[in-house]
C-alpha cells in the first residue's frame, strides 16, 4: 500500500525547490525498478516529484490566500513491467499559513457625524479591518484595534473597532477631528502586522449659542421723503452656531415704535429696519427704538442657553428734505358758463410750502390757452368758452416754490363748461319729397324731426309751425305731433305739374329754452305725374323713383 504523511507546504517560501514530503509504496524495497508519478493540477509546474524516491517538491512560491489546497494524484509503476504497483491515489497538499497579510480597512474612507456636546460613551462609528490570513491558524488573523490619534476625545474598543466619545466636544472650538485607528494582527504580539485607517469625525451643530448683537448702539438715518416700506438700514447679530441653529428673528420691543418695524432677512440673517409710517422732519426729527434678537428654532432641552435675548438700541435721525408745495386739495373741479366774457372768474386753488421756510408759491396751468392763473391761485378765462365745442377741460395746475424752482407739485384741474341756450333747433336732416298731381286733401306728404346742439336740463321740446306766408298759402299744412316730430299734409285736392312743378315750404322750429330760440327750415316738395296705383311717372325736376323716399340717380 501507499505510505505517506499529511503534506504541508508553507506559503511564500523563497527557495526554488521546497521539499514537502515523500510518497512511497511499501513494496519499494530497493530491489525493484519503481517509478513514481505525480498527476493533477499543479503537477510539473507547481509541484515536482523525484521519480526515483517519491520525494515531492514545491518549485513555486505559493500564496495560501490565493489557493490553500492542492489535490493531486500519485502513481507508482514498475519500470520492468510497465504496470502499476499500487492503485492511483489522490492526496492533498495543504498550504500552511504564515502571517504575511496585514489587516486592511476595506470600507475606507470612514466618515462619521456626531452631535457636539454628546455625552461620554456615545457611539460614533465602527471600523472593521480584514486580514486575509487564516483565522484558524494561530493568531495570524486575530485583530486588536487601538487609537493612534484622537485622544482624549475618542476611544476605540480593542476587539470590536467601535469608536466612542470619551470627552465632550464643542463644535464652536473645533468642528472636525481626524482619528487614526490601528489594527494589529497576532493580537498585538511581537511580529504582528498592522494597518491603519483615518476616520474623519465631523461634529454636527446643536443650538447651544444664542445670537448676540455685535453693537450695543446703531445710528440710522431716514429721509422724511422716504415712502413706507423703505429699508433704512440693517442691524446684525452673530450666532456661533450654524445652519438652522443660527437662524434668527429680529423684533422691536413692545410699545417702542409704531413708526418702524424690523424684518429678518433669513438668507443673510440681518435685521432690516423698515419705515412703517411716513416721518415728517417738521413734526419729529429723531426716534429711539430697542431691538431684540432670538433664534428661530430652539429645542426645549436647549432653552437653558437662550434665557435672555440680546438687545440693542437704534437711534434714527430724520433728515429734512426740501419738500414740494402741498395743495390744499388733491384735485379741483370748477364750473363756468359758456359764452362768459374773457377774464371771468373760474375758481381759486391754494398750495403751501410744507417746509419751515414757507417759500412763496407760483402757479401755472399747463398747456391751456383758455384759462389763466395768477400768483394768488385765482383762475380766470382768457377766451370765450363754447360748451358745444368743449364741455370739460382736464388741466394740470403746477405749484412751484419761488426760492427753489425745482420743487414743483402738480394736481389735476377739471373745469366744466355749463350750457346756455345759444342754439336754435333745426332739421335733423335735409328733407325733399313729392306730391302726386291727383293727390287728395289731408294726405301725409312727409314726417320731419329736429335736433338742438344745446344741452337741456329737462328734455328738449320742439314746436313746429309754418311761416306766416306758407300759412296763408293753403296748399299744405303742418301738424305738431308733440313728440319732437311733425307731419306735412296736403291742404287741397289736385296739383298741376305744368303750372306749379315745385313748392318750397318754410317751417319754423322753436325750442323750450329760456329764452326760446327759433329757426326757419325749408322743405322742398315736387309735383309728379303718378299712375293710378300711385307710382311715380314723371316729375319736371327729374325722374323720381319712389323707394322709401327719394333717391337721386
Amino acid at each position: 500500500g501507499w505510505v505517506w504523511n499529511q503534506f504541508f507546504v508553507p506559503e511564500e517560501m523563497n527557495t526554488t525547490s521546497h521539499h514537502i514530503g515523500q510518497l512511497r509504496s511499501d513494496l519499494d524495497n530497493g530491489n525493484n525498478s519503481f517509478q513514481y508519478k505525480l498527476l493533477g493540477a499543479g503537477a510539473g509546474s507547481t509541484f515536482i516529484i523525484d521519480e526515483r524516491t517519491g520525494d515531492i517538491y514545491a518549485i513555486q512560491k505559493l500564496d495560501r490566500e490565493e489557493r490553500s489546497l492542492y489535490i493531486l494524484r500519485a502513481q507508482v509503476i514498475d519500470i520492468a513491467t510497465g504496470r502499476a504497483v499500487e492503485p492511483e491515489s489522490e492526496f492533498v497538499i495543504k498550504v500552511s499559513d504564515i502571517n504575511d497579510n496585514e489587516p486592511k480597512f476595506l470600507d475606507e474612507p470612514y466618515e462619521a457625524i456626531v452631535p457636539e456636546m454628546s455625552p461620554e460613551g456615545t457611539l460614533v462609528i465602527q471600523v472593521t479591518a480584514s486580514d486575509a490570513d487564516d483565522p484558524s491558524s494561530g493568531n495570524n488573523a486575530r485583530l486588536l484595534y487601538s487609537l493612534l490619534q484622537g485622544q482624549p476625545y475618542f476611544s476605540v474598543e480593542p476587539t470590536t473597532g467601535v469608536i466612542r466619545i470619551s470627552s465632550k466636544m464643542d463644535r464652536e472650538l473645533q468642528d472636525e477631528y481626524w482619528v487614526i485607528i490601528q489594527a494589529k494582527d497576532m493580537i498585538g504580539q511581537p511580529g504582528a502586522l498592522s494597518g491603519t485607517t483615518s476616520v474623519l469625525i465631523k461634529l454636527s451643530d446643536v443650538n447651544d449659542n444664542k445670537p448676540i448683537f455685535k453693537e450695543s448702539l446703531y445710528r440710522l438715518t431716514v429721509s422724511e421723503s422716504a415712502p413706507t416700506g423703505t429699508s433704512i438700514g440693517t442691524i446684525m447679530a452673530y450666532d456661533n452656531d450654524i445652519g438652522e441653529n443660527a437662524e434668527m428673528d429680529y423684533s422691536i420691543e413692545e410699545d417702542d415704535s409704531q413708526t418702524f418695524d424690523i424684518i429678518t432677512n433669513h438668507e443673510t440673517q440681518e435685521g432690516i429696519v423698515i419705515l412703517k409710517k411716513k416721518v415728517d422732519f417738521e413734526h419729529q426729527n429723531h426716534y429711539g427704538i430697542r431691538a431684540k434678537v432670538k433664534n428661530h428654532h430652539v429645542p426645549e432641552q436647549l432653552m437653558k442657553y437662550h434665557t435672555e435675548a440680546s438687545t440693542t438700541f437704534i437711534k434714527i435721525q430724520v433728515e429734512d428734505v426740501d419738500e414740494p408745495p402741498l395743495f390744499l386739495l388733491p384735485y379741483y373741479v370748477f364750473e363756468v358758463f359758456e359764452e362768459t366774457p374773457q377774464g371771468s372768474f373760474v375758481g381759486v386753488v391754494s398750495a403751501t410750502d410744507p417746509d419751515n421756510r414757507k417759500s412763496p408759491i407760483r402757479y401755472s396751468i399747463t398747456r391751456s390757452k383758455v384759462f389763466n392763473i395768477n400768483d394768488n391761485g385765482t383762475i380766470t378765462t382768457s377766451n370765450s368758452l363754447d360748451r358745444e365745442i368743449s364741455a370739460w377741460y382736464n388741466l394740470s395746475i403746477t405749484a412751484t416754490e419761488k426760492y427753489n424752482i425745482e420743487q414743483i407739485s402738480s394736481i389735476p384741474l377739471y373745469v366744466q363748461v355749463l350750457n346756455i341756450n345759444d342754439h336754435a333747433p333745426e332739421f335733423s336732416q335735409y328733407y325733399e319729397t313729392y306730391v302726386c298731381e291727383n293727390a287728395g286733401s289731408g294726405q301725409v306728404i312727409q314726417t320731419i324731426s329736429a335736433v338742438d346742439r344745446d344741452e337741456s336740463i329737462e328734455e328738449h321740446h320742439f314746436y313746429f309751425n309754418l311761416s306766416v306766408e306758407d300759412t296763408n298759402n293753403s296748399s299744405f299744412t303742418i301738424i305738431d305731433n308733440q313728440d319732437n316730430t311733425a307731419v306735412i299734409l296736403t291742404n287741397r285736392t289736385g296739383f298741376n305739374l305744368q303750372e306749379e312743378p315745385v313748392f318750397y315750404i318754410s317751417i319754423l322750429i322753436a325750442d323750450n329754452g329760456i329764452p326760446s330760440l327759433t329757426s326757419t327750415n325749408t322743405l322742398t316738395i315736387h309735383v309728379c305725374d303718378c299712375g293710378d296705383s300711385g307710382s311715380t311717372q314723371t316729375c319736371q325736376y327729374q325722374e323720381l323713383v319712389l323707394s322709401m323716399g327719394f333717391k337721386t340717380e
Epitope: Q22, D28, G30, D50, E51, R52, T53, D55, I79, A80
Partner: antibody, heavy 120, light 108 residues
Framework: QVQLQESGPGLVKPSQTLSLTCTVS??????????WSWIRQHPGKGLEWIGY???????FYNPSLRSRVTISVDTSKNQFSLKLSSVTAADTAVYYC????????????WGQGTLVTVSS | EIVLTQSPGTLSLSPGERATLSCRAS???????LAWYQQKPGQAPRLLIY???SRATGIPDRFSGSGSGTDFTLTISRLEPEDFAVYYC?????????FGQGTKLEIK
C-alpha cells in the same frame, strides 16, 4: 560493457552557460530501466549530485541547482546533455556523467570526468 | 536534505589490516538505499556496495557493508595496496541524493 564519455569545453566565461554532453556506448539509453545522471566534484572536495533524466525526458534536479540546470536527452544519438546557466567560479569542477541503475538506484557506471574551469 | 557525515576524515592503516569506515545520516535512511564508492586520484568513483550490504559486480569479497537507520559501516577485512583511496557513502532514499564528505584511507 557500458561506457560513458563526457565532452564539452573545458573553459567557460562567468555568466555564460556551461554545456556538456555524455555519449553512451555499449547499451541503449532508450532501453529503459536506467536513469542518466550528472555529478560534479569541486577541486579537492566531495561529490555533489546534479540531476538525472529518463529516456522519456522526465527529469529531476538537485533543488540547490534547479533554477540553473537543464538536462536533456537525444536517444537517436544515444546522448544526454547538461546545461548550467549563469556560471561563476564556484561552478569550477570535474563533471561526471553516470548511470543510475533502476533496481539498485546506485550509480553503477561513470564516465572518466571532465574538468570545467569558469574563468574570464 | 539528508546530511551524511563520514568518520574518520582520514584513516592511516597498513596493508593487511582491517579498515572500518563509518557513515552517519542526519535522519533515518532505508538500508535499501545506501551505497559506498571508492575514488582514486584522477579517476571517477567506482561503486562498491549498494543496498547497504550488496556488493557490486566485480567487487572483491573483502569489502562488506552493514548498518541500518542512521549508522552504516564499510569494512575492508584485509587491506590490499590498491585499496588505499578515498571512500564516499551516498544515500538515495530521499531526494536529493547526497554524498558524505569522504574518508581518506592512506598507507601508514
Amino acid at each position: 560493457q557500458v561506457q560513458l564519455q563526457e565532452s564539452g569545453p573545458g573553459l567557460v566565461k562567468p555568466s555564460q552557460t556551461l554545456s556538456l554532453t555524455c555519449t553512451v556506448s555499449g547499451g541503449s539509453i532508450s532501453s529503459g530501466g536506467y536513469y542518466w545522471s550528472w555529478i560534479r566534484q569541486h577541486p579537492g572536495k566531495g561529490l555533489e549530485w546534479i540531476g538525472y533524466i529518463y529516456y522519456s525526458g522526465s527529469t529531476f534536479y538537485n533543488p540547490s541547482l534547479r533554477s540553473r540546470v537543464t538536462i536533456s536527452v537525444d536517444t537517436s544519438k544515444n546522448q544526454f546533455s547538461l546545461k548550467l546557466s549563469s556560471v561563476t567560479a564556484a561552478d569550477t569542477a570535474v563533471y561526471y556523467c553516470a548511470r543510475d541503475s533502476s533496481s539498485s538506484r546506485a550509480l553503477d557506471y561513470w564516465g572518466q570526468g571532465t574538468l570545467v574551469t569558469v574563468s574570464s | 536534505e539528508i546530511v551524511l557525515t563520514q568518520s574518520p576524515g582520514t584513516l592511516s592503516l597498513s596493508p593487511g589490516e582491517r579498515a572500518t569506515l563509518s557513515c552517519r545520516a542526519s535522519q533515518s535512511v532505508s538500508s535499501s538505499y545506501l551505497a559506498w564508492y571508492q575514488q582514486k586520484p584522477g579517476q571517477a568513483p567506482r561503486l562498491l556496495i549498494y543496498g547497504a550490504s550488496s556488493r557490486a559486480t566485480g567487487i572483491p569479497d573483502r569489502f562488506s557493508g552493514s548498518g541500518s537507520g542512521t549508522d552504516f559501516t564499510l569494512t575492508i577485512s584485509r587491506l590490499e595496496p590498491e585499496d588505499f583511496a578515498v571512500y564516499y557513502c551516498q544515500q538515495y532514499d530521499s531526494s536529493p541524493r547526497t554524498f558524505g564528505q569522504g574518508t581518506k584511507l592512506e598507507i601508514k
